[in-house]
């Protein structure tokens, strides 16, 4: 979190910036910055590989739940879309693209229909959902 | 916007940032910061009046939707929370806080209960309530 | 087209047995949870039952938990519905269903009939 | 009796709006997705609304959906006697890990 004195280099001249408030970034122009975290919603249905790759070319991933504290914007997003969750039917486990195992009760898993990815659904439920099913998708950057 | 070289001060070094990203702010501590406005989506459920004072006493307003391309977050957002929109009994209009006139096309205005209250609701529909019944709110604070 | 058939409905003692039938077509069945809705004459619609695509999570209404049973058997597309120890509470027509957990897309069967009487 | 709470009927001329409203709770409208299911006479029930206010393709845009905390509305525009059926809510609920519906609602067309 940056400090209260910042150098706007485009004006050159200091500003000053209530200690009770900051900035949050660095993101991609244009998305959402929250617990500097940068986050992005895609409108557009692709199926997880897809969604996935378009993440990937903005440097960033699929959406990772690590905590609903740091993360309790989520609680409020409608509808369904793509996260970087997969099931790894080898040992049954469900982790996420960075290969870390899904922590317990940060998600409510509804595995009721066939497939191994996930879509986030608002207050922190999990639907899997056949990975080749289009859907929008949430891509993620976390910041330094 | 923040150009690419910023000054943090409190290590007194310079952080190189991709062009293509930036810092978003400054805001309120913990508040979502997109496309250089900040919101923050409160729980407690508050009448419109007391809602409008919480905002106040951050030195916020009730959300104000002023562009579906600069608020697109707004969007995705579940449920119905109080914004700054009531209704002008004597010439009719709907208004925000800062006096000035709903644009047309902004929002769908639904009016499902008698009132001079607007409670925001995904993809950018406005339900008319009466202004002391409680729900959840958004405040928001423009960066300048 | 998408198709579900129900059968296996009629007449039956309280206390006697019944097993209902659906037949699933049109879509890849074994990747879908299916369920089991139910309407006595003249009322609304009551869920009963659902089990997931491949049988391992089940849940039912608490009506019926402990004497329905619902299954499915995946190589021959269809979804079942054991009935015991019947009561005249759940004379209804039994509706098979593929509702939406994720999106807009549901199917519904013709439903079929099941009547407790003596 | 109902998880779900629904007004048992309904009426209105054609040509008016009405609306039903459908009452839950935090384990089922206030945390889940509510559908509307219209019921004709005789036939099964068809999916009108999903995920609280989405229509499905080829349902009319004069059906609209609505939700606030743990209730639930559905609203009907430019009445048509061919609206005259019968009207489900449905969700999911956590607590029950099971669908529940409203009692269903009779619209009827004057």
């Known amino acids: 979190i940056w400090s209260a004195v910042f150098l706007n280099s485009l004006f050159n001249q200091e500003v000053q910036i209530p200690l009770t408030e900051s900035y949050c970034g660095p993101c991609p122009k244009n998305w959402i910055c929250y617990k500097n975290n940068c986050y992005q919603f895609f409108d557009e249905s692709k199926n997880w590989y897809e969604s996935q790759a378009s993440c990937m070319s903005q440097n960033a991933s699929l959406l990772k739940v690590y905590s609903k504290e740091d993360q309790d914007l989520l609680k409020l997003v409608k509808s369904y879309h793509w996260m970087g969750l997969v099931h790894i039917p080898t040992n049954g486990s469900w982790q996420w693209e960075d290969g870390s195992i899904l922590s317990p009760n940060l998600l409510t898993i509804i595995e009721m229909q066939k497939g191994d990815c996930a879509l986030y659904a608002s207050s922190f439920k999990g639907y899997i959902e056949n990975c080749s099913t289009p859907n929008t998708y949430i891509c993620m950057q976390r910041t330094v | 916007i923040w150009s690419a070289v910023f000054l943090n001060s409190l290590f007194n070094q310079e952080v190189q940032i991709p062009l293509t990203e930036s810092y978003c702010g400054p805001c309120p501590k913990n508040w979502i910061c997109y496309k250089n406005n900040c919101y923050q989506f409160f729980d407690e459920s508050k009448n419109w009046y007391e809602s409008q004072a919480s905002c106040m006493s951050q030195n916020a307003s009730l959300l104000k939707v002023y562009s579906k391309e600069d608020q697109d977050l707004l969007k995705l957002v579940k449920s119905y929370h109080w914004m700054g929109l009531v209704h002008i009994p004597t010439n009719g209009s709907w208004q925000w806080e800062d006096g000035s006139i709903l644009s047309p096309n902004l929002l769908t205005i639904i009016e499902m209960q008698k009132g001079d209250c607007a409670l925001y609701a995904s993809s950018f529909k406005g339900y008319i309530e009466n202004c002391s019944t409680p729900n959840t709110y958004i405040c928001m604070q423009r960066t300048v | 087209q998408v198709q579900l058939v129900e059968s296996g409905g009629g007449v039956v003692q309280p206390g006697r047995s019944l097993r209902l039938s659906c037949a699933a077509s049109?879509?890849?069945?074994?990747?879908?949870?299916m369920h089991w809705v139910r309407q006595a004459p003249g009322k609304g619609l009551e869920w009963v039952a659902v089990i997931s695509y491949d049988g391992s999570n089940k849940y039912y209404a608490d009506s019926v938990k402990g004497r329905f049973t619902i299954s499915r058997d995946n190589s021959k597309n269809t979804l079942y519905l054991q009935m015991n120890s019947l009561r005249a509470e759940d004379t209804a027509v039994y509706y098979c269903?593929?509702?939406?957990?994720?999106?807009?897309?549901?199917?519904w069967g013709q439903g079929t009939l099941v009547t407790v009487s003596s | 009796q109902s998880v779900l709470t629904q007004p048992p009927s309904v009426s209105e001329a054609p040509r008016q709006r009405v609306t039903i409203s459908c009452s839950g709770s935090?384990?089922?409208?206030?945390?889940?997705?509510v559908n509307w299911y219209q019921q004709l006479p005789g036939k099964a029930p068809k999916l009108l609304i999903y995920y609280d206010d989405l229509l499905p393709s080829g349902v009319s845009d004069r059906f609209s959906g609505s939700k606030s905390g743990t209730s639930a509305s559905l609203a009907i525009s430019g009445l048509q006697s061919e609206d005259e059926a019968d009207y489900y809510c449905?969700?999911?609920?956590?607590?029950?890990?099971?669908?529940?519906f409203g009692g269903g609602t009779k619209l009827t067309v004057l």
């Open positions: 935090s384990s089922n409208i206030g945390n889940n997705a």
């Open positions: 449905a969700a999911w609920d956590d607590s029950l890990f099971g669908w529940v």
């Open positions: 269903a593929r509702l939406p957990w994720v999106g807009s897309v549901d199917y």
């Open positions: 049109g879509f890849t069945f074994s990747s879908y949870a």
